[in-house]
């Protein structure tokens, strides 16, 4: 017998062809011999089956000797053997209906697990293979699990169900809720304005939740909350904000914060958390602030940086257009009795300048 695979919720068309290319009498029945539909002349007649309101045919094809059975909004329990009786012949078609669903929401937080569950008719033994948007293949039976979802797992998952050498393909859209970057670093000279941006890696029509930025200043023994806010339909409203520093937060996405000036006491690292409505867990983004200060005190020219710098970063002091006078993998460098001129303090990573501060040394008379 012919095997046809269908997808839950879809429409399937089972074919039945007569040798005569004309409209003749036909009937479709299920395995219990209950009539589903048939014809009386040019009229469609329906039997007492459970498919009554979901079964149909194409009258336009009857004249060509084609008498299809169309079943809409397929259910797993529609899996059955369907018999077409035409011209004293019986054509049997076995319909197997499968469903594949994410057994949680399809909007999942980064790091959470995705479980796909296959619904299948009794007696079937399908195999499933899914391909993630980043090309990763996973195989399984009735359930497939992916732990520790990453940002690259956002998108359309394509799953193929194989049964009796026949295939049916499912597409499931998964949205991984995360910030675009797990971590970012901002380099500023003392006194400069600071802007922190926290763009999300997903878009949804209505976004509601609440968030907080905790800050661990390098000079402080413990972290403190800098700001708490609510998010309602993508509108940001500040609930509480520290008075030092004088932070401002933008009211529209992407989440955006500004400090009027970078100061050594603010250098450090922060953690912005966002709890979304109806979701367990939180989104996180780390943000780091590195602050540079160049000063001249009597005969000592000093350059310092505060904040989370990697050990491979180089701090140097040089007179403009000259070789570096001092260059160290440290957070402070100095030159005694500096020559007059424009001095540059540079923080660099493998030759790439991350931060630069200029200071003018006047001649001493």
């Amino acid at each position: 017998k012919k095997v046809v695979l269908g997808k839950k919720g879809d429409t399937v068309e089972l074919t039945c062809t007569a040798s005569q290319k004309k409209s003749i009498q036909f009937h479709w029945k299920n395995s219990n011999q209950i009539k589903i539909l048939g014809n009386q002349g040019s009229f469609l007649t329906k039997g007492p089956s459970k498919l009554n309101d979901r079964a149909d045919s194409r009258r336009s094809l009857w004249d060509q000797g084609n008498f299809p059975l169309i079943i809409k909004n397929l259910k797993i329990e529609d899996s059955d053997t369907y018999i077409c009786e035409v011209e004293d012949q019986k054509e049997e078609v076995q319909l197997l209906v499968f469903g594949l669903t994410a057994n949680s929401d399809t909007h999942l937080l980064q790091g959470q697990s995705l479980t796909l569950t296959l619904e299948s008719p009794p007696g079937s033994s399908p195999s499933v293979q899914c391909r993630s948007p980043r090309g990763k293949n996973i195989q399984g039976g009735k359930t497939l699990s992916v732990s520790q979802l990453e940002l690259q797992d956002s998108g359309t998952w394509t799953c193929t169900v194989l049964q009796n050498q026949k295939k049916v393909e499912f597409k499931i859209d998964i949205v991984v809720l995360a910030f675009q970057k797990a971590s970012s670093i901002v380099y500023k000279k003392e006194g400069e304005q600071v802007e922190f941006s926290f763009p999300l890696a997903f878009t949804v029509e209505k976004l509601t939740g609440s968030g907080e930025l905790w800050w661990q200043a390098e000079r402080a023994s413990s972290s403190k909350s800098w700001i708490t806010f609510d998010l309602k339909n993508k509108e940001v409203s500040v609930k509480w904000v520290t008075q030092d520093p004088k932070l401002q937060m933008g009211k529209k996405l992407p989440l955006h914060l500004t400090l009027p000036q970078a100061l050594p006491q603010y250098a450090g690292s922060g953690n912005l958390t966002l709890a979304l409505e109806a979701k367990t867990g939180k989104l996180h983004q780390e943000v780091n602030l590195v602050v540079m200060r160049a000063t001249q005190l009597q005969k000592n020219l000093t350059c310092e940086v505060w904040g989370p710098t990697s050990p491979k970063l180089m701090l140097s002091l040089k007179l403009e257009n000259k070789e570096a006078k001092v260059s160290k993998r440290e957070k402070a460098v100095w030159v005694l009795n500096p020559e007059a001129g424009m001095w540059q303090c540079l923080l660099s990573d493998s030759g790439q300048v991350l931060l630069e501060s200029n200071i003018k040394v006047l001649p001493t008379w």
């Epitope: 509108e235 409203s237 500040v238 401002q248 933008g250 009211k251 529209k252 009027p260």
Partner: antibody, heavy 119, light 107 residues
């Protein structure tokens, strides 16, 4: 076409109250944030108060905080500004303004209603 | 609250002149700044939103730009109908704040 029409202005004594209304036509009121902006005679524009489309969040300039209350009635497509403890410096033309879909700018303004606080 | 410092407060110019008006924000405000034109006895009208987006129906001689926290409105060639008062408005966060205004007069 979207139109905003303010009403409720007038002469009031210091310490008195007034309620301004802003009737909107041609828009789904609950979709947009709205603001009240005022202009004292011969002076510049001053933002007074704002309300989110849902009506859940309200905001005020420091100069009116605790005295003015902004509300909206989506069923009537009307924005209100309840002004209590009025002072001479509240004398101004009060405009209501609708913000763009993503709060990008105040794209539609009413013609204004005049409030005079004087004894 | 974020302060918006607008300059100059008044400006005399002739038809055909190129004119620039500046607003400086006390905080970073991204591109969340608009420019508004107001004529005597009339409600303000938006010219530019989000720093540089020209509103429909606004002549292309108007343009906006940003450098850090400094925002500029430029009128490339003044026309008689451009003589009015211009305001910047930060809508980065509440409370919104306007600049003090620039009155553009005929020389």
């Amino acid at each position: 076409e979207v139109e905003l029409l303010e009403s409720g202005g007038g002469l009031v004594q210091p310490g008195g109250s007034l309620r301004l209304s802003c009737a909107a036509s041609g828009l789904t009121f609950s979709t947009f944030a709205m603001s009240w902006v005022r202009q004292a005679p011969g002076k510049g524009l001053e933002w007074v108060s704002g309300i989110s489309g849902s009506g859940e969040n309200t905001y005020y300039a420091d100069s009116v905080k605790g005295r003015f209350t902004i509300t909206s009635d989506n069923s009537k497509n009307t924005l209100y500004l309840q002004m209590n403890s009025l002072r001479a410096e509240d004398t101004a033309v009060y405009y209501c303004a609708k913000e763009g879909y993503n709060w990008n700018y105040m794209d539609v303004w009413g013609k204004g209603t005049t409030v005079t606080v004087s004894s | 609250a974020i302060q918006m410092t607008q300059s100059p407060s008044s400006l005399s110019a002739s038809v055909g002149d190129r004119v620039t008006i500046t607003c400086r924000a006390s905080h970073g405000i991204r591109n969340d700044l608009g420019w508004y034109q107001q004529k005597p006895g009339k409600a303000p009208k938006v010219l530019i939103s989000e720093t540089s987006s020209l509103q429909s129906g606004v002549p292309s001689r108007f343009s906006g730009s940003r450098s850090g926290t400094d925002f500029t409105l430029t009128i490339s060639s003044l026309q008689p109908e451009d003589f009015a008062t211009y305001y910047c408005l930060q809508d980065y966060t509440y409370p919104y704040t306007f600049g003090q205004g620039t009155k553009l007069e005929i020389k």
